[in-house]
Every structure is written in C-alpha cells, then in structure tokens.
Interface confidence: low
C-alpha cells in the first residue's frame, strides 16, 4: 500500500500556503483528486509529489494515491482543507445527474472542518427541502440525498454558519432521471369497433411512461392523424392521450387504426380495426354440425356463435319438439362474450332422456331483426330384440323385431342345445338378413325393423337366436322350441336407466 507524507488523514492549511504531498510506493504511484488550480505534479523515482505554492479554497478535497501495479489495488488518501474565511464551500460540480433511487452526492466540500456543526442543505432562494428528503453530510464529500426521487430534481445550495450568519454555496442542479423500463405503455380503446354509417364513434389512444420524453400518435391505414394531445401526470406516470371523435362515421373512416408510442428505449404499437357497416347485422353460426346424434344417457353441449351489431336485445333457447312441451332449463343455458361483437351461447343437455330428442332452436334479436339456428338432436339406442313364433301363409316363421337407433342389423343363429345365447362352438347355422323390413322410422325415434326366418320344422333340441346390433351396442333374443310349444328367452331383462 502506498504511503503519503505527511502521514496524517487530514491537513488544514490557510490560503496562499505551500502544500507538498508525497506518495511513495513499491512501484510507480499516481495521484487522484478533484481537478483544481495551482497544483504541480512530478515524480521522483518510486514517489510522486503533488504540490502548490499558493493553495486556494478550490484545492480543498480528498487526494488519493494509488499504485497501479498493485494487484490488491491498495491506496492511501489525505484530505486537504484550505480554510478560507470568505469561502466555506468548494463546490466540485454545477449539476449532478443520477437515476431514481440512487444516492445523489452533492459535492459541497467544507473548506474548514470546524464549520461542520453548522451545515445544512437547502433549495435555492432559501426554500426548505421537500418533505421526506433523507440526506446526510460528510465534510470530505458533501451532502448525500439518499434514494433520490424524481420530484427532488431541484436546484440546491449548501449552507454553513460562519460568525453567526449563513453562507451559501453556489447552486447545484440535481437531475433525478426516471429509470425507463422500456417503451411507453399503450392502450387503444376500443380493441375493435363497429358502427353503422352515420353513427358517432370514439377511438382513444393513450400512452404512459415514467418519463415525460416520449411521443405518441394515432394512424389510420398508415396515415398519421393530426389529433391534439392531452397530457396529464398521475400515479407517478406521464400520460399523453389522443382522442379521435367522429360524429358521423362513413366508410372512409373504416380500417386499421394504430396507436404508436416511442421513447429512447424503443417503440410500442397496438392496433384495432374499425368496421363501418350499412345497417345492423346479426349472424348466427356453429362450429358443430346442426344434426347431432348422441347416445341416450350421455350429455351434449350445443354451441352457437353470435356476431351482432348493435348488441342483442334478446335471446333464448327453445325446444321445438316433437316429444314433450318442456323447455330447456335457463340454468343450463350459458352465455360467454368473446369480445364486444361476438358471443358464444351454450345449452348444456346432461344425461339425455328419450323425451329430449328433437329440435333445439337458438333465437336472437337485435335492431337488425330476428335470427334462429336450429339443431336436430337424435338419440342413439342399443337394439331391443323380441322373437315370436307365428305362421305366415301357412309356413312356420320366427319373427324378430329389433328396435334401436341407428337402424339395427339382424343376424339369425341356429345352435345346438338349449341356451340363452349361442356361442361359437354351438352354432350350426348363421343367416344375415341384409334387408330387414323397416316397421317404423320417424325422425328422432328409434327405428324398428322386422326380420322373418321361415322354419319348416323346428328342431326341438336346438335354439334359434335373433341378434341385432348397431353402432351403440347389440341385443339378442333366444327362441327355444319345446314340445309343449315354443319358449322364448330374452338374454337379460332390458334395463334402461338414462
């Protein structure tokens, strides 16, 4: 570590005095301090001498000697006071620029350490400091305003009490700069706008930043609009607002509007689209197929997208039949707004019952009129099967009726022994009926088909089974001829609990 001679932390001299400060180190050494008049600097081998033959108050300051070659970066310092009765302060800067929340050092150096007890910091023209200004003083360095705020950007003076009167320093301008995190924040409202020709419209573009130095403009289809700007300051942010007011819109006002703001950190922009229409409109659509098929007992959500301007004056879901006169429960109808002009309406149909098949219509109304969108809901059922023995045109015939949706396919099986259901090992014969007769096929109802199997002679130790299947499931009915007459066996009792 270099050594300074005289070996004292502080040196107090009078104006006009000769001051010689010598720094000695192992290698070359350097002096560092506030640039000020009258100093002479020269080297002598491994020492460096800083001297003046005519010290003034401006030489007051801390002088540091460093050894550049020292990897530990050791240094020694001495503080020089040139105590001038007429000049209690040596101000090293006229302006101090810091960022907000940094400590701001106002470098008023006392020329006489004895004066330390009577120092204070004031704003120019003797005005007191702003409330909550937290500061400290060091005779070597000056006043430090801790965690400076933008509002503390002021002109300050340092005051010392000399012989019962306050003596002021020249002023120091403190500039506390906002820490600008990025380009200004932007809002453009509305995000989308639709108006009928002749209506009024308003588009507001606003930008805000912690710093006042930013620009904002609104452009329409790449043409910058000349709109007077309103400025404001609140919540510690500067706001600039451009309001475009159109009292009678026309088609040339339609298009893309962009709100653009920029500062030193960059540019932000946000856009919206303005549609001008000739008249009110109301469009209903669905991403779903309007013809729906759902297995009985399952649930379904019917969704309708609505695009409308002006807004809806009314809407509802209606059940159009054909079964009961029930209407959808309001609690099952849900509306969500995607944005100002688009909405989604959902009707939830949980655990569908047979009586709930049919047509569901969503109706909406606005000044443009009524619109409706109708869904057709058909329920799918697994087949139900029954078999009877009868004579048709004198021939013994097994008659199988199968009811379900979609239309069931019918297969006959003949197997050995008496069984509720033929398994593969027992099967003697299989007949597919590709075209069973459709007995009933009404919209939203089950389809009932009938298949006939003509049997000349019933084999008594055999079972005849009618199997029906569709995309939902299958059903069967076993027919067992016995000497006392035919006997039929459904495989299980058909349970239906939707």
């Amino acid at each position: 570590i270099p050594v300074i001679e005289p070996s004292v932390p502080e040196l107090v001299v009078k104006p006009g005095a000769t001051v010689t400060l010598r720094c000695v180190g192992n290698g070359s050494v350097e002096w560092d301090g506030p640039p000020s008049p009258h100093w002479t600097l020269y080297s002598d081998g491994s020492s460096s001498i800083l001297s003046t033959n005519n010290a003034t108050f401006q030489n007051t300051g801390t002088y540091r000697c460093t050894e550049p070659g020292d990897p530990l970066g050791g240094s020694a310092a001495i503080h020089l006071y040139v105590k001038d009765p007429a000049r209690p302060w040596n101000v090293l800067a006229q302006e101090v620029v810091v960022f907000e929340d940094q400590d701001a050092l106002l470098p008023c150096l006392l020329t006489d350490p004895v004066l330390e007890a009577g120092v204070s910091l004031v704003r120019v023209r003797g005005r007191p400091l702003m409330r909550h200004t937290n500061y400290s003083f060091s005779p070597w360095h000056g006043f430090t305003i801790h965690r400076a705020k933008f509002i503390q950007s002021q002109d300050y003076q340092c005051s010392a009490l000399m012989g019962g009167r306050k003596v002021m320093s020249i002023s120091i301008r403190l500039k506390v700069q906002k820490v600008i995190p990025g380009p200004p924040a932007l809002t453009l409202v509305p995000a989308e706008l639709v108006r009928i020709r002749g209506e009024a419209a308003q588009i507001v573009c606003s930008a805000s930043s912690v710093d006042v130095n930013f620009d904002v403009f609104l452009q329409h289809n790449n043409t910058k609009l000349a709109i007077p700007q309103q400025s404001d300051f609140h919540n510690n942010r500067y706001q600039k607002v451009l309001t475009l007011n159109l009292d009678q819109v026309d088609f040339q006002h339609a298009g893309n509007y962009s709100c653009v703001a920029s500062n030193v950190q960059g540019k932000h922009s946000t856009s919206m689209f303005f549609r001008v229409v000739e008249s009110a409109y109301l469009n209903l659509s669905s991403e779903q197929n309007l013809i729906q098929e759902v297995t009985v007992g399952e649930g379904l959500n019917l969704k309708v997208m609505v695009e409308a301007y002006p807004g809806l004056q009314g809407f509802n879901w209606t059940y159009l039949g054909p079964f009961s006169d029930h209407q959808p429960e309001p609690k099952l109808a849900n509306a969500t707004t995607k944005d100002t002009y688009r909405h989604t309406f959902t009707l939830s149909l949980p655990r569908l019952k047979p009586s709930e098949a049919g047509r569901y219509s969503f109706l909406a109304r606005n000044p443009g009129g009524w619109r409706a969108l109708t869904f057709e809901l058909t329920l799918r059922y697994p087949p139900e099967v029954s078999v009877i023995w009868t004579f048709i045109n004198g021939s013994g015939t097994l008659l199988c009726a199968a009811s379900g949706y979609p239309q069931p396919n019918v297969t006959w099986l003949q197997c050995s022994g008496h069984t509720d259901r033929c398994d593969e090992a027992q099967v003697l014969q299989v007949w597919d009926d590709p075209y069973p007769e459709v007995l009933s096929q009404e919209p939203f109802h089950k389809v009932t088909v009938q298949s006939l199997l003509t049997v000349e002679t019933l084999e008594h130790n055999q079972t005849y089974e009618c199997r029906a299947h569709n995309s939902v499931g299958s059903g069967s009915w076993a027919f067992i001829p016995i000497s006392a007459g035919a006997h039929t066996h459904p495989p299980d009792e058909f349970l239906f609990t939707p």
Epitope: A200, D215, H220, K224, A226, P228, Q229, L246, D247
Partner: antibody, heavy 117, light 110 residues
Framework: QVQLQESGPGLVKPSETLSLTCTVS????????WSWIRQSPGKGLEWIGY???????NYNPSLKSRVTISVDTSKNQFSLKLSSVTAADTAVYFC???????????WGQGTLVTVSS | QSVLTQPPSASGTPGQRVTISCSGS????????VNWYQQFPGTAPKLLIY???QRPSGVPDRFSGSKSGTSASLAISGLQSEDEADYYC???????????FGGGTKLTVL
C-alpha cells in the same frame, strides 16, 4: 350542416384582453376539436389553439403565455381570450372545427379585431 | 414569415393547368398530411384538399393534390375564371404540436 358564428368587440385597446365567442349550431359541441385561427396581413393564417369539450386545450407555443380558450357546453359555445394585445394582434379571427387530419372543415365567417387606442 | 413556403402568385389562362407548390420540412409536410384551402376575398377559407389528395364533397375533380417528401403541390386543370382566389397549404407540425400554414398564393386567371 354545422355552422359557426364568431362574436365579440371589433376594437380592442393595446395591452387589454381580446375576447371572442364562437357559437356552434347544427351540431353538438360535445365532440370534435374546436379551434381559433387568425389571419393578419403580416403573418398570414396562424393557428391559435384547440379546445375539446372536456376543456382540454392545446395552444400555439408562440401565443401560449397570453392565450386562454374555454368552452361552455350548455351554450354550445367556445371562447378565446388573448391578453396584453398589441397592434400585431390585429387580424381577422376565425373559429373552426378541426378535421381528424389537422385541417379545418367548417369555419365561421370571421370577425375583424383591430387593436388600436 | 410562414412555416410553409408558397409562391406569392400564380396565373394562367382559362382551360390551362396551373400548379401551386408548397415547401415544408420533415417536422410538418415530411411526416404529416397536407391540406389546401381556397379563399375568396372577404370570406373564410374553404377546405379544398385534405390528406394530401382528398377532395371534400362538392369540390370539382379539376382540383388535385399531391405530396412528395417535404413538398406538396395543388394542381388545377381546366382553369376557370371562378378559380381566381387565394390558395393556402397547411400541415400539422410535430414540433409545434399543431397546424402550420403557407403564406398563400394569389391565383389570377388571365
């Protein structure tokens, strides 16, 4: 059709305050920006300032220290006050409604104000 | 001294095409749209062209505007005696944060 009509004294003494009113008819003042423009032989057309119905104003920097524009929505009027006038303020003063591109679509017929003692 | 520069006068004979120029800077014409006004003696200016080249309804298509860089021009084709008037260009000025005008051009139909 929007119509604008300026009114106020045609003669103002130097150092006094010039006061003019613009009455808007055929439309509400509660939209658009409203402006004062003057035309003098020496300076041509010169924009003085804008006002919005909310009271927000924007002035020409060269006149900012002397000008005040205010609005009275209940009367569908806006006003101009120009203080400390000199002979250089002698001009025809127009009120106008601003276009969104910065132009002026509707103008009053103008009123001549002479600054003279 | 006007911010935008126009020739003080222009002239032409009936049927001719006349062009009036308007010169500005990057803070006005260079970055904003130009408007043109027609003014007859003793009346208020009338908007003739807005947004560089747009005509308000009622303005004949003989009047057209254009802009290039920091200059703009107004063209009048098929000059008519009733076109004799003062013509002013105007543009928004970013540094002023308001509109600026040209000094005006007096058009004479010979």
């Amino acid at each position: 059709q929007v119509q604008l009509q300026e009114s106020g004294p045609g003669l103002v003494k130097p150092s006094e305050t010039l006061s003019l009113t613009c009455t808007v008819s055929g439309g509400s003042i509660s939209s658009y920006y409203w402006s004062w423009i003057r035309q003098s032989p020496g300076k041509g057309l010169e924009w003085i300032g804008y006002i919005y119905y909310s009271g927000s104003t924007n002035y020409n920097p060269s006149l900012k220290s002397r000008v005040t524009i205010s609005v009275d929505t209940s009367k569908n009027q806006f006003s101009l006050k120009l203080s400390s006038v000199t002979a250089a303020d002698t001009a025809v003063y127009f009120c106008a409604r601003a276009l969104l591109t910065g132009g002026f679509a509707y103008w009053g017929q103008g009123t001549l104000v002479t600054v003279s003692s | 001294q006007s911010v935008l520069t126009q020739p003080p006068s222009a002239s032409g004979t009936p049927g001719q095409r006349v062009t009036i120029s308007c010169s500005g800077s990057s803070s006005n014409i260079g970055s904003n749209t130009v408007n043109w006004y027609q003014q007859f003696p003793g009346t208020a200016p009338k908007l003739l062209i807005y947004s560089n080249n747009q005509r308000p309804s009622g303005v004949p298509d003989r009047f057209s505007g254009s802009k290039s860089g920091t200059s703009a021009s107004l063209a009048i084709s098929g000059l008519q005696s009733e076109d004799e008037a003062d013509y002013y260009c105007a543009a928004w000025d970013d540094s002023l944060n308001g509109p600026v005008f040209g000094g005006g051009t007096k058009l004479t139909v010979l």
